[in-house]
């Protein structure tokens, strides 16, 4: 969390941003909130990106003002216009690109004063893994698949029964480049699996960490997955 204050002495307002990560090809949100104003027409929101000449987005007098928008953001940004009055200056970003990563500034002007805060935005690819029993294999084998990751992650297997065990000798991980030539499909196979055990396939890069669990018993198979972004710090 980054909290910024205005630089004009007593005429300062608090602006708060949250560092976040964007998933390539998906929509992203750059979070920014500020002390609200009573009149929408008095609020100016400017989003800027370090190293970019034009604006990312501008909203003033109750509407978008995009005549100075940088080419790389054309047709790709929107504020939540109905939430500006309550202090939400967050920006929606369409079809996140690797090149969208960087430092953004959320700059606010209201009748109370000015304020700004920076936001670190990371971009990459991350997806939920799915763990299945590989019935085609000669021995009991688990297959962990996740469709989209970038940068290349690490994959670690763990088991509830053999806590602390190193499965690197009995597992094999491969990375297959997807058609857009950036993200990769992750496939990891774990051999010599025992019954009545819960196995976890953990995939991690500097943006996200995802885990796929599978519980294999005589009578049933239970699966669970979750994904966590690693860099959500507020400012």
């Amino acid at each position: 969390l980054i909290i910024g204050f205005g630089i004009s002495g007593r005429h300062s307002i608090t602006v708060t941003t949250v560092a976040s990560a964007g998933n390539i090809g998906e929509d992203g949100i750059l979070s920014c909130t500020f002390e609200p104003d009573i009149k929408l027409s008095d609020i100016v929101i400017q989003w800027l990106k370090e190293g970019v000449l034009g604006l990312v987005h501008e909203f003033k007098e109750g509407k978008d003002e995009l005549s100075e928008q940088d080419e790389m953001f054309r047709g790709r940004t929107a504020v939540f216009a109905d939430q500006v009055i309550v202090g939400n200056a967050s920006l929606r970003l369409k079809n996140v690109q690797l090149t969208d990563a960087g430092t953004y500034k959320c700059y606010i002007i209201t009748s109370k004063g000015k304020g700004n805060a920076n936001l670190e935005y990371k971009t990459g690819a991350f997806s939920m893994p799915e763990v299945n029993v590989d019935y085609n294999a000669s021995s009991e084998t688990l297959r962990c698949e996740a469709p989209r990751w970038f940068p290349q992650p690490t994959v670690v297997w763990a088991s509830q029964v053999d806590q602390g065990a190193n499965f690197s000798e009995v597992s094999n991980t491969s990375f297959e480049l997807n058609s857009e030539n950036v993200t990769m499909k992750v496939v990891s196979v774990l051999y010599n699996v025992t019954i009545n055990n819960t196995y976890s396939c953990m995939i991690e890069n500097d943006i996200a960490k995802a885990t796929g669990d599978i519980k294999v018993t005589e009578s049933e198979i239970k699966r669970r997955s979750h994904l966590q972004l690693l860099n959500s710090k507020a400012s």
């Epitope: 998906e26 509407k63 003002e65 100075e68």
Partner: antibody, heavy 119, light 107 residues
Framework: EVQLVESGGGLVQPGGSLRLSCAVS????????VQWVRQAPGKGLEWLGV???????DYNAAFLSRLTISKDTSKNTVYFQMNSLRAEDTAVYYC?????????????WGQGTLVTVSS | DIQMTQSPSSLSASVGDRVTITCKAS??????VSWYQQKPGKAPKLLIY???NRYTGVPSRFSGSRSGTDFTLTISSLQPEDFATYYC?????????FGQGTKVEIK
């Protein structure tokens, strides 16, 4: 109320040029992009290009060499010019405005102007 | 270019029927699919944007949904004024593209 009104259609000789205008009201050209879409008689919709609030443009690659979209913000008007016309360019040409600045659909359309390419 | 394959190309239905039109994108388009209604000699009208958001003034019988790259427009109870041609379109990546259209006719 948002309105877009096209003009400039009519009969054009093969190999000739076409210049259409789209006069807008009820919104600012510095807030929204304006799209151009055409529809040949009895056929579907085909996207041709867009001019953004900043004045930058994106074109359908199939028309890149012969299409120019421009605007005069002070006159609230967008211009569409296509060169080297052929019979298959006969269509109703529409200008349209996006529903949001992030382009989730075309909410407002002009009435369309018919362009016939024939000798 | 992203292909939007719309089906069926035409259908006959009666007033009160539930009508479903589908559109399949040849690659990922996120939620950037919109649906339009067009009557002869008129400009298209936006019904649904962002895959499932009903545009202002559009009756609640029109709804849109998404499953991966498959998109559906549903008219829950067809009314006489709904007989028209319907198009889907994608605005995820250039060039923006449309489906071939579905003509809804009176049975």
């Amino acid at each position: 109320e948002v309105q877009l009104v096209e003009s400039g259609g009519g009969l054009v000789q093969p190999g000739g040029s076409l210049r259409l205008s789209c006069a807008v009201s009820g919104f600012s050209l510095t807030s929204y992009g304006v799209q151009w879409v055409r529809q040949a008689p009895g056929k579907g919709l085909e996207w041709l290009g867009v001019i953004w609030s900043s004045g930058s443009t994106d074109y359908n690659a199939a028309f890149l060499s012969r299409l120019t979209i421009s605007k005069d913000t002070s006159k609230n008007t967008v211009y569409f010019q296509m060169n080297s016309l052929r019979a298959e360019d006969t269509a109703v040409y529409y200008c349209a405005r996006d529903v949001t600045t992030i382009v989730e659909g075309f909410a407002h359309w002009g009435q369309g102007t018919l362009v016939t390419v024939s000798s | 270019d992203i292909q939007m394959t719309q089906s069926p190309s035409s259908l006959s239905a009666s007033v009160g029927d539930r009508v479903t039109i589908t559109c399949k994108a040849s690659e990922k388009v996120g939620t950037y699919v919109s649906w339009y209604q067009q009557k002869p000699g008129k400009a298209p009208k936006l019904l649904i944007y962002g895959a499932s958001n009903r545009y202002t003034g559009v009756p609640s019988r029109f709804s849109g949904s998404r499953s991966g790259t498959d998109f559906t427009l549903t008219i829950s109870s067809l009314q006489p004024e709904d007989f028209a041609t319907y198009y889907c379109g994608q605005t995820y990546s250039y060039p923006f593209t449309f489906g071939q259209g579905t003509k809804v006719e009176i049975k």
